[in-house]
């Protein structure tokens, strides 16, 4: 069930087409997971600053049941901050991913929970 | 109306080079991504890139690289093509297309094409 | 790079059959799948995406199915507006690859 949502002042026309499948297949390759649990969710045009500048910038989280940990979460911030720069142009500088390891208790999908 | 207008038949030598355009009416370049699609009797065919204007990121096909180069003028609303080093298995039909209205940086379904641009190739 | 094999290739029908014309893809491209018509001399026009959306102004004896790697373009009661060229064309990550066409001819 990875979750991978941006937060970015990038405004939406600066979003490539094909960038939310190319997320999405990068993180099932990344993760392990197959694509169709893969969820990603780009949200453009927002207020926001990082380090007091209003340059492009981006916040992020990965929520994911397992497979989150110091060396992986170092394997998907080169992987992630890689594309932000490669198809937004934000600075790998400019963007914070916070990483969540979900109980699969606490997500509920398709009228019940992954527990 | 969205229209993509693209430049007239072109015969070119093999070695020159060639640019075609296409002009957007109906809405703001900066936009959408432009593509660029190649048709052949030989090959159907086949996706050559697309070009974010606004930040002036590409998207290609390894194929083509070194072969087409994607450019975009925005103060005339204008995305360019330049082909190099042009052989008779270049001569074809070049269109550029744009997606449908909605759904930003998802899948481009091509919705709007241009009438295409024919390229021959022959000393 | 994915490969999309189209067929047939071509098909002889009669105005008021129905036809069926296949997509298959070298993998699964999770129904990031367009269908096009295209007349002679003519662009191509959008007809079905995300495998089975009809895209606007498309008349509904068009429809589009699939999954996976599995994909079909169904034309019902044909009328003479339809015969010319068919092409699908994946989304699935770069390059998007074309078929190969179908020429639908009129019997």
């Known amino acids: 069930m990875p979750m991978f949502i941006v937060n970015t002042n990038v405004p939406r026309a600066s979003v490539p087409d094909g960038f939310l499948s190319e997320l999405t297949q990068q993180l099932a390759q990344a993760t392990g997971k197959p694509p169709q649990y893969i969820a990603v969710h780009v949200v453009p045009d927002q207020l926001m600053a990082f380090g007091g500048s209003s340059e492009p910038c981006a916040l992020c989280s990965l929520h994911s049941i397992g497979k989150i940990g110091g060396a992986q979460n170092r394997s998907y911030s080169k992987l992630l901050c890689g594309l932000l720069a490669e198809r937004l142009r934000i600075s790998p500088d400019r963007v914070y991913i916070n990483y969540y390891d979900m109980n699969a208790a606490n997500v509920g999908w398709n009228n019940s929970t992954f527990a | 109306e969205v229209q993509l207008q693209q430049s007239g038949p072109e015969l070119v030598k093999p070695g020159a080079s060639v640019r075609i355009s296409c002009k957007t009416s109906?809405?703001?370049?900066?936009?959408?991504?432009m593509h660029w699609m190649k048709q052949s009797h030989e090959k159907s065919l086949e996706w050559i890139g697309g070009?974010?204007?606004?930040?002036?990121?590409?998207s290609d096909n390894q194929k083509f690289r070194g072969k087409a180069t994607l450019t975009v003028d925005k103060s005339s609303n204008t995305a360019y093509m330049e082909l190099r080093s042009l052989t008779s298995a270049d001569s074809a039909v070049y269109y550029c297309?744009?997606?449908?209205?909605?759904?930003?940086?998802?899948?481009?379904?091509?919705?709007?094409w241009g009438q295409g641009t024919l390229v021959t190739v022959s000393a | 790079d994915i490969q999309m094999t189209q067929s047939p290739a071509s098909l002889s029908v009669s105005v008021g059959e129905t036809v069926t014309i296949t997509c298959r893809a070298s993998?699964?491209?999770?129904?990031?799948l367009a269908w096009y018509q295209q007349k002679q001399g003519k662009s191509p026009q959008l007809l079905v995406y995300?495998?089975?959306n009809l895209a606007d102004g498309v008349p509904s004896r068009f429809s589009g199915s699939g999954s996976g790697t599995q994909y079909s373009l169904n034309i019902y009661s044909l009328q003479p507006e339809d015969f010319g060229s068919y092409y699908c064309?994946?989304?699935?990550?770069?390059?998007?690859?074309f078929g190969g066409g179908t020429k639908l001819e009129i019997k």
């Open positions: 297309a744009r997606r449908g209205n909605n759904y930003y940086g998802s899948s481009p379904w091509f919705a709007y």
């Open positions: 109906g809405y703001t370049i900066t936009e959408y991504t």
């Open positions: 070009i974010t204007p606004n930040t002036g990121v590409l």
């Open positions: 993998e699964n491209i999770y129904s990031n």
């Open positions: 995300a495998a089975t």
């Open positions: 064309q994946h989304f699935w990550g770069t390059p998007y690859t």
